[in-house]
């Protein structure tokens, strides 16, 4: 690995991450005469190490019988957290992750918080609100995003290697200028992250500096490196 010039930049045109909470002031959707079952499913990308707040459907507390959060994480038994208004009691089944909790006491706030989000929190979260008018659901397909670590180095004569290490989902790599590139390699890790590696060669001696651009849902990054001279090259034209 060369000591060559290496500069990191973070693009100003990053994708904006979803806010930490999808809870909003929504209009009351229940009507006293309604027997319609409202079901909403939301795909929600959340960056690892941030906090996330998941909300139940906007049902008035006076209409509630039971609030249930159902949490389905990969490779684990389904966890349920429930609150019965009549008895003011909460109950948990198969819930072992202490980072997933009620935001406050369920009689005050039915929202669920993940504090902080870990890679193992990928999964499906559903709030079921039982009322005399039927059950109202809101589900979240939570996709945990992991920012890849980006490295760039010159491996041999005018050949550069750019790696986006342990990102989730897999990052995309492009080059300025375009080089003669080997097929992109992907290495999958047990925790769901992916390392992407791109190796390119530049024959033209007028290429001075190459830029590796990494695109990812958590934001874009670029690194650039001035190519070293080919060994044995003493004098060259431009």
């Amino acid at each position: 690995q060369s000591n060559n010039s290496l500069m990191l930049q973070t693009s100003k045109e990053n994708h904006t991450l979803a806010s930490n909470s999808l809870c909003m002031d929504e209009k009351q959707i229940t009507q006293n005469h309604s027997k319609v079952l409202a079901e909403v499913n939301i795909s929600w990308p959340v960056q690892m190490a941030r906090n996330a707040v998941l909300c139940c459907p906007p049902i008035e507390f006076r209409n509630l019988i039971v609030i249930t959060w159902e949490i389905i994480l990969r490779g684990q038994p389904s966890c349920t957290k429930s609150y019965r208004k009549e008895t003011n009691e909460t109950k948990e089944t198969n819930c072992t992750d202490e980072r997933i909790t009620w935001v406050s006491t369920p009689d005050q706030n039915s929202d669920l918080q993940i504090h902080p989000v870990a890679i193992t929190h990928d999964g499906y979260y559903r709030c079921i609100m039982a009322t005399p008018d039927g059950n109202f659901h809101r589900g979240y397909h939570l996709q945990v995003l992991v920012t890849p670590e980006v490295t760039l180095f010159e491996s041999r004569n005018r050949t550069a290697v750019c790696k986006a290490v342990a990102g989730k989902p897999a990052a995309q790599i492009s080059w300025i200028p375009a080089g003669d590139c080997a097929p992109t390699e992907q290495e999958y890790w047990g925790n769901g992250t992916v390392t992407v590696k791109s190796t390119c060669h530049w024959e033209g001696h007028n290429v001075s500096t190459v830029t590796c651009h990494v695109s990812h849902l958590t934001g874009n990054k670029s690194l650039y490196i001035e190519l070293l001279p080919v060994p044995g090259a003493k004098k060259s034209a431009k």
Partner: antibody
Framework: QVQLQQPGSELVRPGASVKLSCKAS????????MHWVKQRPGQGLEWIGN????????NYDEKFKSKAIMTVDISSSTVYMHLSSLTSEDSAVYYC???????WGQGTLVTVSA | DVQMIQSPSSLSASMGDIVTMTCQAS??????LHWFQQKPGKAPKLLIS???NLEDGVPSRFSGSRYGTDFTLTISSLEDEDMATYFC?????????FGGGTKLDIK
Amino acid sequence: QVQLQQPGSELVRPGASVKLSCKASGYTFTSYWMHWVKQRPGQGLEWIGNIFPGSDTTNYDEKFKSKAIMTVDISSSTVYMHLSSLTSEDSAVYYCITYTGAYWGQGTLVTVSA
Amino acid sequence: DVQMIQSPSSLSASMGDIVTMTCQASQGTNINLHWFQQKPGKAPKLLISGGSNLEDGVPSRFSGSRYGTDFTLTISSLEDEDMATYFCLQFTYLPWTFGGGTKLDIK
């Protein structure tokens, strides 16, 4: 921190030559290209060429091939640029640059005058 | 050689204004570049590296962006001390080439 030291000015006669110096410190001198740039009063910047101290490899813009010669002295971490057959057109500020354009010397003002 | 076309060559603006200038590579060449500020009698100072990365110590009112092969330098709220000449440098191909510069005057 990275520093590039250049003399403030050089006064030379037409037809003569001058050797400009650029002393580097604060980084691994032999691992980074050094570039030279020319700026005439009130005008834009022109790239003259570059040298890689680790191997003495040089590149020159076509326009400066018969004007400039770049050399390096590893022991003093200094890059030199020799400019020959000077005319009034060569009166300018000459900058040395490293780290892919991030660091610049303060520039040497070359005045060609009888 | 890659020509860098910079516009405008000069502009006059008032304090607090939003100011933009652009650099474009000839023939739509895909390049990377830096933005510099130069004041009279001084060496150029790197403001934005690699098209969009704000250098340490540079006020956050400066920003750089890229759209295809067009690069833009924006000053979000002009201050007195911003009166200077600004230019871009493409460092992807040899020879490195500079934009012609934008001379910024305060009205």
